[in-house]
């Protein structure tokens, strides 16, 4: 067990803070909830603190919760590939470029680390080149989320990881908006981190609303499990 992994044996409080600017539309989001890495479970609620969110909530899911991949469940035989927990408590910087097909792009930079006993994800997001009447600024996405695989590989030069995946957002007319994600994680501290063999995270997310909440908001339940590395030969012969 890495030292960081020891911090994730129980339920951990989570705080998320985002400041965004998409085509000049500025906004802020605050989120709170909890994560349980034993089950790869995240429960979070987000509020747009500046009024109405100028982009659809589903376009921010990867920035919020795929931001705290330290809550992914890594099976016993894969624990030596869990970069995310090994970087804690000092944490990691997570940078992404998200290309929305035939539309604009988000660039995000986040610091994910423990502040006391709370895991905090602080994010800055800048979006450019979006069409005002496109799927994103035109709010044409359905309020739901598909399952995805998130592919992880080591980046030895930067003592971190590179991550690629393609999100499929459902559009109200029945078509799909693709969002290509290019991600890089580097540790904040200078302690040792686990550099993984290639593998993937399998994610399932459910979006809902709080019937008593008047503010613009999103409620998120997510399960994430690491996969893609088989047991070693010694395991097979036990």
């Amino acid at each position: 067990m890495s030292k960081g992994e020891e911090l994730f044996t129980g339920v951990v409080p989570i705080l998320v803070e985002l400041d965004g600017d998409v085509n000049g539309h500025k906004f802020s989001v605050s989120g709170e909830g909890e994560g349980d890495a034993t089950y790869g479970k995240l429960t979070l609620k987000f509020i747009c603190t500046t009024g109405k969110l100028p982009v659809p909530w589903p376009t921010l899911v990867t920035t919020f919760s795929y931001g705290v991949q330290c809550f992914s469940r890594y099976p016993d035989h894969m624990k030596q590939h869990d970069f995310f927990k090994s970087a804690m408590p000092e944490g990691y910087v997570q940078e992404r470029t998200i290309f929305f097909k035939d539309d604009g792009n988000y660039k995000t930079r986040a610091e994910v680390k423990f502040e006391g006993d709370t895991l905090v994800n602080r994010i800055e997001l800048k979006g450019i080149d979006f069409k005002e009447d496109g799927n994103i600024l035109g709010h044409k996405l359905e309020y739901n989320y598909n399952s995805h695989n998130v592919y992880i590989m080591a980046d030895k030069q930067k003592n971190g990881i590179k991550v690629n995946f393609k999100i499929r957002h459902n559009i109200e007319d029945g078509s799909v908006q693709l969002a290509d994600h290019y991600q890089q994680n580097t540790p904040i501290g200078d302690g040792p981190v686990l550099l993984p063999d290639n593998h993937y995270l399998s994610t399932q997310s459910a979006l809902s609303k709080d019937p008593n909440e008047k503010r613009d908001h999103m409620v998120l339940l997510e399960f994430v499990t690491a996969a893609g590395i088989t047991h070693g030969m010694d395991e097979l012969y036990k």
């Epitope: 605050s30 989120g31 429960t43 709370t118």
Partner: nanobody, 124 residues
Framework: QVQLVESGGGLVQAGASMRLSCAAS????????WVWFRQAAGREHEFVAG????????LSADSVKDRFIISRDDAKNTLYLQMNMLQPEDTATYYC??????????????????RGQGTQVTVS
């Protein structure tokens, strides 16, 4: 789904006591700092009392010090506000709220993500 439900409000005479409860579900109660706010008609939300998540240290507004006591029962997922020597100026809707924020004691009610719907207290 997280739910915070306040109860125990009602109509009482000045000088009486009353205990409010806030029952939480869908949340790991012990992980949060818990706070009571109140809002009198036509006024802003006002911080009443708060209790931190570990150690149970409490903080109260000057207007209720020595009269109101906040407490929590993590096993029952419930927050309490014992209100003694009630005065007409305590008339308000009382709300519970929860947060992980380290600056919970200086956060405005609108900044809280998890909040109840409120219970009305009227002191005649």
């Amino acid at each position: 789904q997280v739910q915070l439900v306040e109860s125990g409000g009602g109509l009482v005479q000045a000088g009486a006591s009353m205990r409010l409860s806030c029952a939480a579900s869908g949340i790991t109660f012990s992980l949060y700092h818990w706070v009571w706010f109140r809002q009198a008609a036509g006024r802003e939300h006002e911080f009443v009392a708060g209790i931190i998540r570990s150690g149970g240290e409490t903080l109260s507004a000057d207007s209720v010090k020595d009269r109101f006591i906040i407490s929590r029962d993590d096993a029952k997922n419930t927050l309490y506000l014992q209100m003694n020597m009630l005065q007409p100026e305590d008339t308000a809707t009382y709300y519970c709220a929860a947060t992980h924020r380290a600056d919970w004691y200086s956060s405005a009610f609108r900044e809280y993500i998890f909040r109840g719907q409120g219970t009305q207290v009227t002191v005649s």
